[in-house]
């Protein structure tokens, strides 16, 4: 709860220009859902759905809340504390080496594979090889047999929120 | 059940200090922010400020920065408001109150039951 | 500091009818605004937060309404357990600060 951010753990395009930064109220930092004013004197709320702040933090601006894109579901709003909670429609995932976009799971295991792993929204479904038992990581299952799978129930969600 | 539990009436002299206390009850006290309100009779509402008692983080109103000093014991989880150099002016009812469950924003969902000053000469 | 103002000090009424209790802000507070009934020897009560969200348990005759500086409270229909004051307050900004109140009593 008490963990704090300031300016400088901020990625490049939410800190603050070098001239705007301030010093905390000598009392401390602004807590969550709040940012500090330009004159380091008062902390001021986020604004409800729009902003948000996670930490106590000495932040000149809230950040931003995230919108969900198309091909994605809203789990959670954004509130003053927490950004919005974005999840992968049902059939589709986002991978860990493309987490900008919601991928289509695939419909079936390549020749010699079954499926052992539904498609969820943060997985393409898993297949593994009848004889040894490997994984496979390819994309495209053969043509001429595949195993065909629907999609998985959400379990869990996969947020890229802050 | 979240409760706060303040001190009993204080009836002191002006030019002393007093020392209030609300003790919190039903939730993890590091966790949430403790704010004091000032009510006199027949008036309305001020805030005098917040102490978190995570962090130890201070917010006074301005207007109360050399009147009240906020402290706390985390053993007993308990707040403490000091009034010093009383005057007439500090005779009012004083509230301690918690914010919201979901975030930090501050209306009060959760107030003492109030402690009276009464400052006589 | 944002001064709130509510600009009736007392508002008359009659059990029944419908009565909107409104409280201004010196600057735009975001609907960062809570309303709070209090009766004589009580602590406040919150009714309303985010200027129109209702408390848990609150009666579904008090609504909230409004954005930037102006605010409303409104009771759809007055009971007799609904005459006290109530206060407007901001929570956008530190120092938080209330309005002066609004004693609502019955004809």
């Known amino acids: 709860e008490s963990a704090l951010i300031t300016q400088q753990d901020l990625a490049p395009q939410q800190r603050a220009a070098p001239q705007q930064k301030r010093s905390s109220p000598s009392e401390g930092l602004c807590p969550p859902g709040h940012h500090i004013s330009e004159d380091g004197r008062d902390c001021i709320s986020c604004k409800y759905g729009q902003d948000y702040s996670t930490h106590w933090n000495d932040l000149l601006f809230c950040l931003r809340c995230t919108r969900c894109d198309s091909g994605e579901v809203e789990l959670s709003p954004c509130t003053t504390t927490r950004n919005t909670v974005c999840q992968c429609e049902e059939g589709t995932f986002r991978e860990e080496d493309s987490p900008e976009m919601c991928r289509k799971c695939r419909t079936g295991c390549p020749r010699g594979m079954v499926k052992v792993g539904d498609c969820t929204p943060w997985s393409d479904i898993e297949c593994v090889h009848k004889e040894s038992g490997t994984k496979h990581s390819g994309e495209v299952p053969a043509v001429e047999e595949t195993v065909t799978s629907s999609p998985g129930t959400p379990a869990s969600p996969c947020s890229l929120s802050g | 059940k979240v409760q706060l539990q303040q001190s009993g009436a204080e009836l002191v002299k002006t030019g002393t200090s007093v020392k209030l206390s609300c003790k919190a009850s039903?939730?993890?006290?590091?966790?949430?922010?403790i704010h004091w309100v000032k009510q006199r009779s027949g008036q309305g509402l001020e805030w005098i400020g917040w102490?978190?008692?995570?962090?130890?983080?201070?917010k006074y109103n301005e207007k109360f920065k050399d009147k009240a000093t906020l402290t706390a014991d985390k053993s007993s989880s308990t707040v403490y408001m000091e009034l010093s150099r009383l005057t007439s002016e500090d005779s009012a009812v004083y509230f301690c109150?918690?914010?919201?469950?979901?975030?930090?924003?501050?209306?009060?969902?959760?107030w003492g039951q109030g402690t009276l000053v009464t400052v006589s000469a | 500091d944002i001064v709130m103002t509510q600009s009736h000090k007392f508002m008359s009424t009659s059990v029944g009818d419908r009565v909107s209790i409104t409280c201004k802000a010196s600057?735009?507070?975001?609907?960062?605004v809570a309303w709070y009934q209090q009766k004589p020897g009580q602590s406040p009560k919150v009714l309303i937060y985010?200027?129109?969200t209702r408390h848990t348990g609150v009666p579904d005759r008090f609504t909230g309404s409004g954005s930037g500086t102006d605010y409303i409270l409104t009771i759809s229909s007055v009971q007799a357990e609904d005459l006290a004051l109530y206060y407007c307050?901001?929570?956008?900004?530190?120092?938080?600060?209330f309005g002066g109140g609004t004693k609502l009593e019955i004809k």
């Open positions: 985010w200027a129109s």
């Open positions: 102490f978190y008692p995570g962090s130890g983080s201070i």
């Open positions: 600057q735009d507070v975001s609907t960062a």
């Open positions: 109150a918690r914010h919201e469950e979901g975030g930090y924003s501050a209306w009060f969902p959760y």
């Open positions: 307050q901001q929570h956008y900004s530190t120092p938080y600060t």
């Open positions: 039903g939730y993890t006290f590091t966790e949430y922010i």
